[in-house]
Interface confidence: low
């Protein structure tokens, strides 16, 4: 026999969650359990399906498991069945809905006075308890001559005046849960005596000098006040304007007309309508007075013929917001072609040369108009009038080279020597038509030079060798005053150069031929022993056959070059004592002596009380301080050469003598005493 | 809030006509050049025609002579006249908005045009 | 008309990954080149006009770039949300022909 261990019973459940219903059997053969809903077969889908031998509800519906289940259990073999009591479910909801008018019929209908009933769909199990709202209020029962029931769905308003307007909303609540209605119902009861709007103001941009009119009427029975105010409250009537509202007229419909208007009269006009009863109902309007201001420029534009250009222009401020349009020769541009305008941009499709012009972008309004020329220039490739040529040019000469091309616009022209940009400086110069002058030509300005002409369109170049033609020089000029020490090997150089290489010979100033102990080997001349009758005027003479000759005069003078007899010794003083630093030098010619102090020439005018130099070169400084400390460097010098020595100067403080030292002991490093 | 939708898409055999229709709204619609653009399921995006604020009209050679657009901007309104359809015009139809910046800165959420016997 | 060829028609790559898509015009389009970005089911959106300026609202780390023919956008890191096909689109003589798109998946 086929028991039944659990059987399905009854249950609350709840819209939309889940649910099962019990069902477990025993039996001595194979059995197969189904249910049956109203005494049909249940169909497994994902909402509601057999768990084991129970039934499963993964969120319960209302409509769906309404009625009867049963639990059924076969065995196939025997035939035997056996059916479980009869379950159902008690299912709680709720579900919004609108608000609706249930009387009358239309809201066409709905006069003052009548009654008007409202419905709340709000619907659900167990029967839920209403509440009803007036622009988010809750309204109670008897309220305010409502009649309102809370366990129903109607409110009825009797009778219906104009304080029952309002927007109607109402909520609902049950063991389920709450709702609140979906849609809710704007209900409007005029009162003819409150001032009602007909006609409202509007915002008006006006010329200067020019009227504007604004138009306002209210309704209301009886008829209601209209008057007009401005900005600042100043009322406007007929009888008593404003001082700065002298030209406004107030019609009777209502409409307030300025003429001559004036920017004091600009700002915000308020139309004010006043019922019987009720609020005053405020409109607004405001009055602009048009205006426009200046664009700003255009810079001219190079285009390149067969490309694509937008020019944009930017619309001048103004009020109201100008139109913007763009003209070429006079003649408005279309909007598509080759030559458009699109937007506020001039665009030149695959630009040919006949393009190029001047056009004009357009901006007005009521305030006035503005316009701003843009000059288009169709760039050409620069074609050649002269080309830079090979060129021989003289040395310490200016020398040009042409690069001349013509193009629209005007081509410009770089210049490259050996691959380098050329760089303005002294000695480069860019003329404007292209030419390159280089001033005062040097040999190694011999080279490879490049000229490109460029436009936006394109470029050209062209290049040319410089010869430089060296002229006869001295390399380097020999110095116009030279020594030689006596006694001693000397040699005087002096080399060339020229388009051809020059011979150089040395003679004498006074025409006598040199010594035989000078000689001249190849314009060097060379003393074995220099001797007193060696000095004097000499001459280097330089020459070849295409460009004659060069002369460079040189005096020599014979000297005994600069020694020492006495050089300064590191010294070291006490504070407060004097410092002697002796230097003495000897030569021919007799050398002055100079003394550079902590890295300046202590000029003998300008040394003070303190400092002294004396007739044999020796430096005093009394009374020294510790910022008399530092190097010492003595200089010697005559017209033929320079000698220099140096030593260190060191101030100390005196010390204090210790008891356990004698009165004569020695300071403990050496000293000057003075 | 700137809004294009359109409607009008459907069933239609080879070689009969089909009109879309793109209401617009959230922005001044006679200031702006509309676009109708289509994609095939699973194909790229490609350019219908184009209708700039005067009127003046623009199409790829693909659809040329047989595809008109209009617009009426009194009823914010972008239309494209589909006629002499093939099943190579099945595709999603989108309507899309042209922005100062030249880029398509809004578009519709499309409607299926299916072109079958 | 301007012919675009787009490349790669498709990627796959990593989160954080830096992502680079290329667009080549026929002829010279100047910067007149735009960007949409376009997820399953959903219909395009801008992200970059005038070859690298960034629409309103567009996160930074995407990016454009090039003038002429040759145009580069590109995803400096990689976000999940990133997954959709993007598409190339110039916009020369009133002509709007887009690319043939690239479809980027997450690795």
């Known amino acids: 026999a086929i028991v039944f261990i659990k059987q399905p019973s009854s249950q609350d459940a709840l819209q939309g969650r889940r649910a099962l219903l019990r069902c477990e059997v025993e039996a001595p053969g194979l059995v197969h359990v189904y249910w049956l809903l109203d005494g049909a077969p249940v169909q497994d889908t994902e909402r509601r399906f057999t768990q084991g031998s129970s039934l499963s509800f993964a969120a319960v519906d209302r409509l769906q498991d309404s009625g009867t289940f049963q639990c059924v259990a076969r065995d196939d073999v025997t035939g035997e069945e056996a059916r479980s009591a009869n379950a159902s479910f008690n299912i709680k909801w709720i579900e919004a809905g609108p608000v609706v008018l249930k009387h009358p019929a239309s809201e066409a209908e709905i006069q003052p006075q009548t009654q008007v009933t409202l419905r709340c769909h709000i619907d659900g199990h167990p029967r839920p308890t209403y509440q009803w709202f007036r622009d988010g209020t809750p309204l109670s029962d008897g309220q305010s001559n409502n009649t309102v029931s809370s366990k129903e769905r109607n409110l009825t308003l009797r009778p219906a005046g104009p304080e029952h307007s309002g927007l109607y909303s109402c909520c609902a609540h049950n063991a389920f849960g709450q709702a609140c209605s979906s849609q809710n119902f704007t209900l409007s009861i005029a009162d003819e005596s409150f001032a009602r709007v007909v006609l409202a103001p509007q915002d008006v941009i006006v010329a200067r000098n020019e009227e504007a009119m604004f138009h306002c009427q209210f309704s209301a029975q009886p008829p209601p006040n209209l008057q007009w105010l401005f900005e600042d409250e100043t009322p406007i009537t007929n009888r008593s304007r404003p001082p700065h509202l002298r030209r406004a007229t107030v019609f009777a419909n209502g409409s307030l007309l300025l003429t001559q208007v004036r920017p004091r009269n600009a700002g915000v006009y308020r139309c004010i309508g006043q019922g019987q009863r009720g609020p005053p109902v405020i409109l607004e309007a405001t009055l602009h007075l048009a205006e426009i201001e200046d664009m700003p420029l255009f810079e001219p534009r190079v285009f390149t013929a067969g490309s694509e250009e937008r020019v944009t222009c930017l619309p001048p401020k103004g009020l109201p917001e100008p139109s913007v349009w763009w003209e070429h020769a006079g003649v408005r541009l279309p909007t598509h072609g080759r030559v458009y305008q699109k937007g506020h941009e001039l665009v030149l499709a695959s630009i040919a040369e006949s393009d190029a012009g001047v056009y004009t972008c357009h901006a007005a309004n009521l305030a006035g108009q503005r316009r701003q020329d843009v000059n288009i220039t169709v760039a050409t490739v620069p074609t050649w009038l002269k080309k830079p040529q090979d060129s021989q040019l003289e040395e310490g000469k200016p020398g040009y080279l042409h690069c001349l091309t013509q193009a629209t616009p005007k081509p410009t022209v770089v210049w490259y020597r050996n691959q380098m940009l050329i760089s303005e400086d002294s000695r480069f110069e860019v003329f404007k038509n292209g030419t390159l002058r280089i001033n005062n030509v040097e040999v190694y300005d011999g080279t490879w030079y490049r000229c490109v002409s460029s436009t936006p369109a394109g470029s050209i170049e062209a290049q040319a060798r410089v010869q430089v033609l060296e002229k006869l020089k001295f390399t380097p000029p020999p110095q116009p005053q030279q020594c030689m020490e006596f006694d001693k090997e000397a040699t005087v150089p002096c080399s060339a150069t020229g388009r051809e290489k020059p011979t150089i010979k040395w003679e004498r100033a006074d025409g006598s031929s040199l010594p035989e102990w000078v000689t001249d080997n190849a314009g060097t001349l060379h003393f074995a022993r220099v001797t007193r009758d060696d000095a004097g005027n000499y001459t280097c003479i330089a020459s070849n056959g295409p460009q004659g000759q060069i002369r460079a005069h040189v005096q020599l003078t014979v000297a005994v070059f600069i020694t020492f007899k006495v050089e300064p010794e590191r010294t070291t003083v006490y504070q407060g004592h004097t410092a002697l630093l002796q230097c003495e030098a000897q030569g021919d010619p007799k050398p002055l002596i100079q003394w550079k102090g902590k890295d300046r020439i202590l000029d003998p005018t300008k040394l003070g009380p303190r400092m002294h130099i004396f007739q044999n070169g020796s430096l005093v400084i009394h009374d020294v301080a510790p910022e008399d400390s530092g190097r010492y460097t003595c200089i010697a010098g005559n017209s033929c050469n320079i000698k220099h020595t140096e030593a260190p100067l060191y101030v100390v403080d005196k010390p204090v003598p210790e008891e356990s030292e004698g009165p004569g002991s020695p300071p403990p490093y050496k000293m000057i005493q003075t | 809030e700137v809004q294009l939708v359109e409607s009008g898409g459907g069933l239609v055999q080879p070689g009969g006509s089909l009109r879309l229709s793109c209401a617009a709204s959230?922005?001044?619609?006679?200031?702006?050049?509309m676009h109708w653009v289509r994609q095939a399921t699973g194909k790229g995006l490609e350019w219908v025609s184009g209708i700039n604020t005067d009127g003046d009209t623009f199409y790829p050679g693909s659809v040329k002579g047989r595809f008109t657009i209009s617009r009426e901007n009194a009823k914010n309104s972008l239309y494209l006249q589909m006629n002499s359809l093939r099943a190579g015009d099945t595709a999603v139809y989108y309507c899309?908005?042209?922005?100062?910046?030249?880029?398509?800165?809004?578009w519709g959420q499309g409607t299926l045009v299916t072109v079958s016997s | 008309d301007i012919q675009m060829t787009q490349s790669p028609s498709s990627l796959s790559a990593s989160v954080g990954d830096r992502v680079t898509i290329t667009c080549q015009a026929s002829?010279?389009?100047?910067?007149?080149l735009n960007w949409y970005q376009q997820k399953p089911g959903k219909a395009p959106k801008l992200l970059i006009y005038?070859?690298?300026n960034l629409e309103t609202g567009v996160p930074s780390r995407f990016s454009g770039s090039g003038s002429g023919t040759d145009f580069t956008f590109t995803i400096s890191s990689l976000q999940p949300e990133d997954i959709a096909t993007y598409y190339c689109q110039p916009y020369d003589n009133l002509m709007y022909t887009f690319g043939g798109g690239t479809k980027v998946e997450i690795k």
């Open positions: 899309a908005r042209r922005g100062w910046n030249y880029g398509f800165d809004y």
């Open positions: 005038d070859a690298s």
């Open positions: 002829q010279d389009i100047r910067n007149y």
């Open positions: 959230g922005f001044t619609f006679s200031s702006y050049d």
